[in-house]
């Protein structure tokens, strides 16, 4: 591992659609990928009338958008489905939303997912 870099070997796994997809609902996912490429964790969720609904969590392949991010933070302004990625084992256990917008608009509070 490169000094100062968190290598991702496993991520929190969650699938809201687990019955239809015939997977576990929750657990720990080992991350696979090309040996020289970086691996990350991700989380996706929806905000339904102020209520946070996790869609999926798991491993994510080498992506410069995720480099050196120890926290899973969505920065896109009001996406349909929120997505964040990070580096480090189980770094997707917590995720938050801090949109990058004009200074006049306040940022949102961090989101702590409700247990399934």
């Amino acid at each position: 591992a490169i000094l100062g870099r968190s290598e991702t070997q496993e991520c929190l796994f969650f699938n809201a659609n687990w019955e239809k997809d015939r997977t576990n609902q929750t657990g720990v996912e080992p991350c696979y990928g090309d040996k020289d490429k970086r691996r990350h964790c991700f989380a996706t969720w929806k905000n339904i009338s102020g209520s946070i609904e996790i869609v999926k969590q798991g491993c994510w392949l080498d992506d410069i958008n995720c480099y050196d991010r120890t926290d899973c933070v969505e920065k896109k302004d009001s996406p349909e489905v929120y997505f964040c990625c990070c580096e480090g084992n189980m770094c997707n256990e917590k995720f938050s939303y801090f949109p990058e917008m004009e200074v006049t608009q306040p940022t949102s509070n961090p989101v702590t997912p409700k247990p399934p």
């Epitope: 696979y32 090309d34 490429k37 991700f42 996706t44 869609v55 999926k56 798991g58 491993c59 994510w60 392949l61 080498d62 992506d63 410069i64 958008n65 896109k76 996406p79 349909e80 489905v81 929120y82 997505f83």
Partner: antibody
Framework: QVQLVQSGAEVKKPGSSVKVSCKAS????????INWVRQAPGQGLEWMGT????????SYAQKFQGRVTITADESTSTAYMELSSLRSEDTAVYYC????????WGQGTLVTVSS | QSALTQPRSVSGSPGQSVTISCTGT?????????VNWYQQHPGKAPKLMIY???KRESGVPDRFSGSKSGNTASLTISGLQAEDEADYYC???????????FGGGTKLTVL
């Protein structure tokens, strides 16, 4: 092993639409992006757009904005690229590629636009 | 994002070295280590050779190397072989907040 298998060649009339599919196997489809690239006969590669296969979020090249739609069907591990209002200049081989680095490519789909 | 600039063609004899350049701007090539190189033989799909400026893709011979100086990325092929004759494209990472762009391509002829 990772494979991206694309749908077969298409011949289309000007003004119509085409939808090309790209079926992924050998990796977890929802763990990366799918990018779409085209190559006109004797020309270079041209990036069209990308989709995040888990969130469905898309980005398109300005040139194709409003004319291209990229979607992903998680249940079949398949990505789709639909191009509308076709013109003769859209005659090209269309490729899908995995991830932001384009590390695996489909075999290509020739779309011919001719009246 | 405007296309990256590559020479139309380069050539070299077997055993020689050739370098293909890819020039962008300070806001793309100059700012990020996200330039890739692809090899394409006639009638075939492109193949990733180098990613992230200088990282060799798995299975790619170490005769292929990538580097960057300022706003220009370079692909160097040493010990040229007949099978290296192909078109080479530089391109950028695409996904998330990054938009893709390719160079115009360089035809490598092995004399």
């Amino acid at each position: 092993q990772v494979q991206l298998v694309q749908s077969g060649a298409e011949v289309k009339k000007p003004g119509s639409s085409v939808k090309v599919s790209c079926k992924a196997s050998g990796y977890k489809f929802t763990s990366s992006y799918i990018n779409w690239v085209r190559q006109a006969p004797g020309q270079g590669l041209e990036w069209m757009g990308t989709i995040n296969a888990v969130s469905g979020s898309t980005s398109y090249a300005q040139k194709f904005q409003g004319r291209v739609t990229i979607t992903a069907d998680e249940s079949t591990s398949t990505a789709y690229m639909e191009l509308s209002s076709l013109r003769s200049e859209d005659t090209a081989v269309y490729y899908c590629a995995r991830g932001g680095w384009f590390d695996y490519w489909g075999q290509g789909t020739l779309v011919t636009v001719s009246s | 994002q405007s296309a990256l600039t590559q020479p139309r063609s380069v050539s070299g004899s077997p055993g020689q070295s050739v370098t293909i350049s890819c020039t962008g701007t300070s806001s793309d090539v100059g700012s990020y280590n996200y330039v890739n190189w692809y090899q394409q033989h006639p009638g075939k799909a492109p193949k990733l050779m180098i990613y992230g400026v200088s990282k060799r893709e798995s299975g790619v011979p170490d005769r292929f190397s990538g580097s960057k100086s300022g706003n220009t990325a370079s692909l160097t092929i040493s010990g040229l072989q007949a099978e290296d004759e192909a078109d080479y494209y530089c391109g950028t990472f695409a996904g998330g907040k990054y938009y893709g762009v390719f160079g115009g391509g360089t035809k490598l002829t092995v004399l």
